[in-house]
């Protein structure tokens, strides 16, 4: 998402249609407190960031309240009065849904239904990944709502589960971010376990889909 303007690289993340985080990496200005100026309406005056992110004591980003805005962020990163990067972006391109909350498991013989609280906006996919110590890779199933039934499980095996939310690519475009994974939960014979024996440490989720 970065730009070539004066060697400034930017990253935008729109957290759950609530908060926008814009971070920058500008090697030329590594010891400079760049300022961030923004507006959500092209006709308004720019406001300056009031919630900076710092790296090694210097500004490296800004957090903005942007709740439920399907709209454009106009922004300018400046060195004093000199703009070093100026852009306007549709924020939804950079959506990152929040991690699933209130994850529950309902077992019935060789199947489990995983549910969680649906987010307040649509066009999302709720993905459950699971594996047993005997599986070399995570298995995956996803649905349009957080109600995912996985069948064909072996009641004697211990399974690890985790859940995340992804923005539908056909709606939000391909450059969004999946949510963070929920915590891993381990189950065997319909009962929760502290861990599954010999389960490798789950891989960290990739930002790309």
């Amino acid at each position: 998402q970065g730009g070539a303007a004066e060697g400034v690289q930017i990253q935008i993340i729109y957290f759950n249609l609530e908060t926008v985080q814009v971070t920058w990496n500008a090697s030329k200005y590594s010891r400079t407190n760049l300022t961030f100026h923004y507006r959500f309406n092209g006709d308004e005056a720019y406001d300056q960031c009031t919630n900076y992110l710092l790296q090694e004591g210097h500004t490296s980003g800004c957090l903005l309240d942007a709740e439920q805005r399907d709209d454009i962020l106009y922004f300018s990163i400046r060195n004093g009065t000199h703009p070093v990067f100026t852009a306007s972006r549709w924020m939804v391109y950079y959506l990152k849904p929040s991690s699933p909350k209130h994850v529950r498991f309902s077992w019935h013989q060789d199947a489990v239904t995983v549910t969680c609280s649906d987010l307040s906006y649509g066009d999302l996919l709720y993905e459950v990944q699971y594996r047993s110590p005997f599986d070399t890779e995570w298995q995956s199933k996803q649905e349009n709502t957080c109600n995912v039934t996985i069948e064909g499980l072996d009641a004697e095996k211990c399974y690890s589960f985790w859940v995340r939310v992804k923005a539908m690519e056909d709606v939000y475009g391909p450059d969004t971010y999946p949510s963070d994974w929920s915590e891993v939960t381990c189950w065997q014979r319909g009962e929760i376990r502290d861990a599954c024996a010999e389960t490798p440490t789950p891989p960290k989720p990739k930002l790309s889909k």
Epitope: G3, A87, W90, V92, Y93, G173, D175
Partner: antibody, heavy 122, light 107 residues
Framework: QVQLQESGPGLVKPSQTLSLTCTVS??????????WSWIRQHPGKGLEWIGY???????YYSPSLKSRVTISRDTSKNQFSLKLSSVTAADTAVYYC??????????????WGQGTLVTVSS | DIQMTQSPSSLSASVGDRVTITCRAS??????LHWYQHRPGETPKLLIK???RSISGVPSRFSGSGSGTDFTLTISSLQPEDFATYYC?????????FGQGTKLEIK
């Protein structure tokens, strides 16, 4: 199959207002998620986006033309319209109406009209 | 505005040739880059969306690649109906902007 057709005068006098209408058939302009655009092409030049009107009637205009542009719609006729005021010879162009693909919100233009040439001249 | 620069601006090729057109954005746009074909007297036609995603009804000889600032449209084996002008367009930046076009002519 969605079809778009531009209509309006082919000749406009300088300082007057250019008015064009796009009639959409085979698809409702109020369908959620879709945006409807005007795009123009100056003779021998590339394409220039003018503005959108959304399924929810929200409008967005190109900053360079914003002070002169109005896009509106008539849902009963399934039409949307462009008004460009205070025209000069520099507004002479082929004007296209187009639909934005539902994806990434307001992305690629997947259906276009044939285009209509508007000449600004006295 | 994000500037889109296409190269070459014109290109002569023969039926059966493999042709590549490039598009460069002045700022990174991820993969939100779309390609169009415009034949004289016809409506512009969407060929590729989001850098590499095919569009239903578009022949498989058209393919796209790239991300960030550099993108490519490839026609694997030119057909007579492919001689046209091709445009790229970015969408995450506002306003949407197009390249200046690449005119593909018969050699």
């Amino acid at each position: 199959q969605v079809q778009l057709q531009e209509s309006g005068p082919g000749l406009v006098k300088p300082s007057q207002t250019l008015s064009l209408t796009c009639t959409v058939s085979g698809f409702s302009i109020t369908t959620s998620g879709y945006y409807w655009s005007w795009i123009r092409q100056h003779p021998g030049k590339g394409l220039e986006w003018i503005g959108y009107i959304g399924y929810n009637s929200k409008t967005y205009y190109s900053p360079s033309l914003k002070s002169r542009v109005t896009i509106s719609r008539d849902t009963s006729k399934n039409q949307f319209s462009l008004k460009l005021s205070s025209v000069t010879a520099a507004d002479t162009a082929v004007y296209y109406c187009a639909r934005s693909l539902y994806g990434g919100y307001k992305d690629a233009f997947d259906s276009w009209g044939q285009g209509t040439l508007v000449t600004v001249s006295s | 505005d994000i500037q889109m620069t296409q190269s070459p601006s014109s290109l002569s090729a023969s039926v059966g040739d493999r042709v590549t057109i490039t598009c460069r954005a002045s700022q990174s746009i991820g993969t939100s880059l779309h390609w169009y074909q415009h034949r004289p007297g016809e409506t512009p036609k969407l060929l590729i969306k989001f850098a590499s995603r095919s569009i239903s009804g578009v022949p498989s000889r058209f393919s796209g690649s790239g991300s960030g600032t550099d993108f490519t449209l490839t026609i694997s084996s030119l057909q007579p109906e492919d001689f046209a002008t091709y445009y790229c367009q970015q969408s995450p930046g506002f306003p949407p902007t197009f390249g200046q076009g690449t005119k593909l002519e018969i050699k």
